[in-house]
């Protein structure tokens, strides 16, 4: 059973992940970002279901493609290089989902834009945080 300290740790990690995803979204949606049109042409894959921490496997599997698209954006739109940003996210995701459980991600048939993809995972973080508080 999760202890209050482990719940607190999970909540902090989710809040960190949420902030990172929001930072990326803000950088992309920045009105000065001339790359938005180009970035929106790239397809991302969404989970059929995302209600538990194990479903973060679906986010982990899309982090490399996310990094590739972020590489298109002007570096000044973000505080960190895409590689460092994604690396930070990856560390949090691995800790949150746990490495001992092997979960096969199931993807939805429809693809999403980078904005829809980020919004979906932001909503996921917010929803899990709300169940923990």
């Amino acid at each position: 059973a999760p202890t209050s300290s482990s719940t607190k740790k999970t909540q902090l990690q989710l809040e960190h992940l949420l902030l990172d995803l929001q930072m990326i979204l803000n950088g992309i949606n920045n009105y000065k970002n001339p790359k938005l049109t180009r970035m929106l042409t790239f397809k991302f894959y969404m989970p059929k279901k995302a209600t538990e921490l194990k479903h973060l496997q679906c986010l982990e599997e899309e982090l490399k493609p996310l990094e590739e698209v972020l590489n298109l954006a002007q570096s000044k739109n973000f505080h960190l290089r895409p590689r460092d940003l994604i690396s930070n996210i990856n560390v949090i995701v691995l800790e949150l989902k746990g490495s001992e459980t092997t979960f096969m991600c199931e993807y939805a048939d429809e693809t999403a834009t980078i904005v829809e993809f980020l919004n979906r995972w932001i909503t996921f973080c917010q929803s899990i945080i709300s169940t923990l508080t």
């Epitope: 790359k35 397809k43 599997e61 490399k64």
Partner: antibody
Framework: EIQLQQSGPELRRPGSSVKLSCKAS????????IHWVRHRPEHGLEWIGW????????RYAQKFQSKATLTADTSSNAAYMQLSSLTPEDTATYFC??????????????WGQGTLVTVSS | DIVMTQSPFSLAVSEGEMVTINCKSS????????????LAWYQQKPGQSPKLLIY???TGQSGVPDRFIGSGSGTDFTLTISDVQAEDLADYYC?????????FGAGTKLELK
């Protein structure tokens, strides 16, 4: 028809620099990234970097960061690569290339014919 | 960077033979979301620019003869040329574009016996 036309062969002295051109036709250069690739027979193919002609944003492979400078001129629908502080190791054929369409960054589907750069004293 | 290990370095063949060229990546090139491997194969003849043969590991580029077949997934990939023709004598390279920077294999030279 999409075509990339590159400038002719160049002979340079060590320590000098050279600027190669890649003129696009059959599409608007701002529609896609332009990549540059080096070919040396004994080393194979190496990716140098890309430029987004739309805003001049560039990315380089680490080893070419201080060697190559990529630019583009949308009015002439062309991309350029300047190579500086040339050494005999820079003797190679340099290609410009672009991907299948604008929804791809890679792979390289359309290539220029290549420009041979020879560095010799 | 992802390292692409290509083998063999060279290959001497007779016309009509079948050949296989292998490429191994230092990490998986499979994107789970679309089940596509971000690997391409190129042919380069002397004095010419590389020509895209196969992308996504197994999709033939338009106009490429169907004797060129790409297969494999994850970290192990193969380019098979069935019924080799004299015009197929060239250098062949694999390219991974799953992660920046894109990296090529060292190449395989296909020569006539």
């Amino acid at each position: 028809e999409i075509q990339l036309q590159q400038s002719g062969p160049e002979l340079r002295r060590p320590g000098s620099s050279v600027k190669l051109s890649c003129k696009a036709s059959g599409y608007n250069i701002t529609d896609n990234l332009i990549h540059w690739v080096r070919h040396r027979p004994e080393h194979g193919l190496e990716w140098i970097g890309w430029i987004d002609p739309e805003d001049g944003e560039t990315r380089y492979a680490q080893k070419f960061q201080s060697k190559a400078t990529l630019t583009a001129d949308t009015s002439s629908n062309a991309a350029y690569m300047q190579l500086s502080s040339l050494t005999p190791e820079d003797t190679a054929t340099y290609f410009c290339a672009r991907s299948l369409d604008s929804t791809y960054i890679y792979p390289f589907a359309y290539w220029g014919q290549g420009t041979l750069v020879t560095v010799s004293s | 960077d992802i390292v692409m290990t290509q083998s063999p370095f060279s290959l001497a063949v007779s016309e009509g033979e079948m050949v296989t060229i292998n490429c191994k990546s230092s990490q998986s090139l499979l994107r789970s979301g679309n089940q596509k491997n971000y690997l391409a194969w190129y042919q380069q003849k002397p004095g010419q620019s590389p020509k895209l043969l196969i992308y996504y590991a197994s999709t033939g580029q338009s106009g490429v003869p169907d004797r060129f077949i790409g297969s494999g997934s994850g970290t192990d990939f193969t380019l098979t040329i069935s019924d080799v023709q004299a015009e197929d004598l060239a250098d062949y390279y694999c390219l991974q574009h799953y992660q920046s920077p894109p990296t090529f294999g060292a190449g395989t030279k296909l020569e006539l016996k």
